[in-house]
């Protein structure tokens, strides 16, 4: 499957926007360092289909939309970023959705791949459940955005490789 | 390969001004802070302050805040640091390190080979 | 500011030999805490990183563990190259600060 040129640019689009999206300096936020426990080796594409990386990387959009669609994240971030950041994600989710039905095809179930999916969704959980104990501080959505920003660089040389593959 | 590297080392007279560069290669500049340490000659480390490069937000230690400034342009992938009117007490070798910033990962694990800057009249 | 202490300031060791440093904080600094060596004219390395977590590359002879105010790094069998200095320094709060060092020399 090939994923569009705009698909490399909405990312780099994404980043930019979670850059901007910064209210706070950093520098008041160290205290809050929190280990999130990235799921590097779902990342670690040496023994990866590549319908089980499109899958991680739908999971792991998602989630950063879930995560920043909360009425804490509009409360907390500016809405006309998050605005333009839904819109990123939303046309990621579309292009990786396409990529799934052709490397995947219908028959497959995405259950296939439900460790790595899992493991994705208890890193959100553990994103989530730190906001909630920070009781969404402002150096909270700090660590968050910083760390999204990480995973979602991630992502992004994952796609690169697999693009590097084809 | 991640590689910090500084600009060679420097011989001023006292009340000269100084801007040494620290160029960061092999990762992405902007997703790590740069902090700046000094080592006088025969003594330890001293954390002088730090840059987020992404947009040049600075943070110092009290005993460096204004009489160092700390820069970077990203476009270049360096950072800096910098004197206005230097004293012989600055004789010291400098290093630039990255950290990760509200990343958990490892703190300055790449370090600058080091600039050595000697004041005297 | 979160001050940092370190002991001994210097021992006198053999190859082979375990060797312990420790470092104590004025104040909590939940873990963030990472050890460093330095050989003369040479930039420092970093060993260990939040304590106990080995840096990538490192000798497993070098371990780190504690936390709160006390934190140790201990070389289980010294090797001819671990003769150097090394700091402790903390990352929890700015400004940032290092131990005043231990020196590691020959016996």
């Known amino acids: 499957c090939d994923l569009p040129q705009t698909h490399s640019l909405g990312n780099r689009r994404a980043l930019i926007l979670l850059a901007q999206m910064r209210r706070i300096s950093p520098f008041s936020c160290l205290k809050d360092r929190h280990d999130f426990e990235f799921p590097q080796e779902e990342f670690d594409d040496k023994q990866f289909q590549k319908a089980q990386a499109i899958s991680v990387l739908h999971e792991m959009i998602q989630q950063t939309f879930n995560l920043f669609s909360t009425k804490d994240s509009s409360a907390a971030l500016d809405e006309t970023l998050l605005d333009e950041f839904y819109i990123e994600l939303d046309q990621q989710l579309n292009d990786l959705e396409s990529c799934v039905m052709q490397e995947v095809g219908v028959i497959e179930s995405p259950l296939m791949y439900e460790d790595s999916i899992l493991a994705v969704r208890k890193y959100f959980q553990r994103i989530t459940l730190y906001l909630t104990e920070k009781k969404y501080s402002s150096c909270a959505w700090e660590v968050v955005r910083a760390e999204i920003m990480r995973s979602f660089s991630l992502s992004i040389n994952l796609q690169k490789r697999l693009k590097s593959k084809e | 390969e991640v590689q910090l590297v500084q600009s060679g080392a420097e011989v001023k007279k006292p009340g000269e001004s100084l801007k040494i560069s620290c160029k960061g290669s092999?990762?992405?500049?902007?997703?790590?802070?740069i902090g700046w340490v000094r080592q006088m000659p025969g003594k330890g480390l001293e954390w002088m302050g730090i840059?987020?490069?992404?947009?040049?937000?600075?943070a110092y230690s009290p005993s460096f805040q204004g009489q160092v400034t700390i820069s970077a342009d990203k476009s270049i992938s360096t950072a800096y640091l910098q004197w206005s009117s230097l004293k012989a007490s600055d004789t010291a070798m400098y290093y630039c390190?990255?950290?990760?910033?509200?990343?958990?990962?490892?703190?300055?694990?790449?370090w600058g080979q080091g600039t050595l800057v000697t004041v005297s009249s | 500011d979160i001050q940092m202490t370190q002991s001994p300031s210097s021992l006198s060791a053999s190859v082979g030999d375990r060797v312990t440093i420790t470092c104590r904080a004025s104040?909590?600094?939940?873990?963030?805490l990472n050890w460093y060596q330095q050989k003369p004219g040479k930039a420092p390395k970093l060993l260990i990183y939040?304590?106990?977590s080995l840096q990538s590359g490192v000798p497993s002879r070098f371990s780190g563990s504690g936390s709160g105010t006390d934190f140790t790094l201990t070389i289980s069998s010294l090797q001819p190259e671990d003769f150097a200095t090394y700091y402790c320094?903390?990352?929890?709060?700015?400004?940032?600060?290092f131990g005043q060092g231990t020196k590691v020399e020959i016996k």
């Open positions: 390190a990255r950290h990760p910033g509200l990343n958990w990962a490892p703190d300055f694990d790449y």
């Open positions: 104040q909590s600094i939940n873990g963030v």
């Open positions: 320094q903390q990352s929890h709060d700015f400004p940032l600060t």
């Open positions: 840059i987020d490069p992404s947009d040049s937000d600075t």
């Open positions: 092999g990762y992405s500049f902007t997703s790590y802070w």
């Open positions: 939040f304590a106990s």
